[in-house]
């Protein structure tokens, strides 16, 4: 089962629209790429709950991408 | 409230097609990637197949690849499976199932999904 076939993207759907920050062990941001045209907000749950994509349009989301995006640049 | 309701099941022989359909209600296909599993006596529950009715992406365990084709109808709410050339060892209950924010990584992880039917029958016979 070929996982990361080119032209794929991590997730699959439009995502959930918003997690319980209580929730988050932390989030990670993919930007578009060769391999994705979208971006991708993933959410790694506590308690080895395992991940979820966050819709990327939701309000959630954007909070999260704008404060990634402070703590980087 | 969110249910899923499998039905098409049944016996046929070996060779023979079967269209399974689920029957979403209490969401829209659209905001969830939809899954079917299978398990057999005695054996751990397994993907199948999946689709994301947002983009019309699909999905296939190797052992069904170009034999089963997955679908779905956006105003019925349905999601089908039309399985062809049917061996013995495809004996199972079939189940679907709906994820929501759902990972390439966890695609056949059954505790990824939020929501299950209660199963449909599908027999096998040589």
């Known amino acids: 089962f070929p996982m990361f076939k080119r032209g794929r993207c991590l997730c699959i759907g439009p995502g959930v629209k918003a997690v319980k920050v209580a929730d988050i062990e932390k989030a990670s941001i993919m930007y578009p790429s060769n391999n994705c045209d979208k971006i991708e907000v993933i959410i790694t749950l506590k308690e080895n709950k395992g991940q979820r994509c966050l819709n990327p349009k939701s309000k959630q989301a954007r909070l999260i991408i704008k404060k990634v995006e402070r703590k980087n640049f | 409230e969110v249910q899923l309701v499998e039905s098409g099941g049944g016996l046929v022989q070996a060779g023979g097609s079967l269209r399974l359909s689920c029957a979403a209600s209490?969401?829209?296909?659209?905001?969830?990637?939809i899954g079917w599993f299978r398990q057999a006596p005695g054996k751990e529950r397994e993907g199948v197949s999946l689709i994301s009715s947002d983009d019309g992406s699909t999905y296939y365990a190797d052992s069904v690849k170009g034999r089963f084709t997955i679908s779905s109808d956006n105003a019925k709410n349905t999601v089908y499976l039309q399985m062809n050339s049917l061996k013995p060892e495809d004996t199972a209950v079939y189940y679907c199932?709906?994820?929501?924010?759902?990972?390439?990584?966890?695609?056949?992880?059954?505790?990824?999904?939020?929501?299950w039917g209660q199963g449909t029958q599908v027999t096998v016979s040589s």
């Open positions: 209490g969401f829209t296909l659209n905001d969830y990637a």
């Open positions: 199932a709906a994820a929501q924010g759902l990972l390439l990584l966890s695609l056949w992880v059954p505790t990824q999904y939020d929501y």
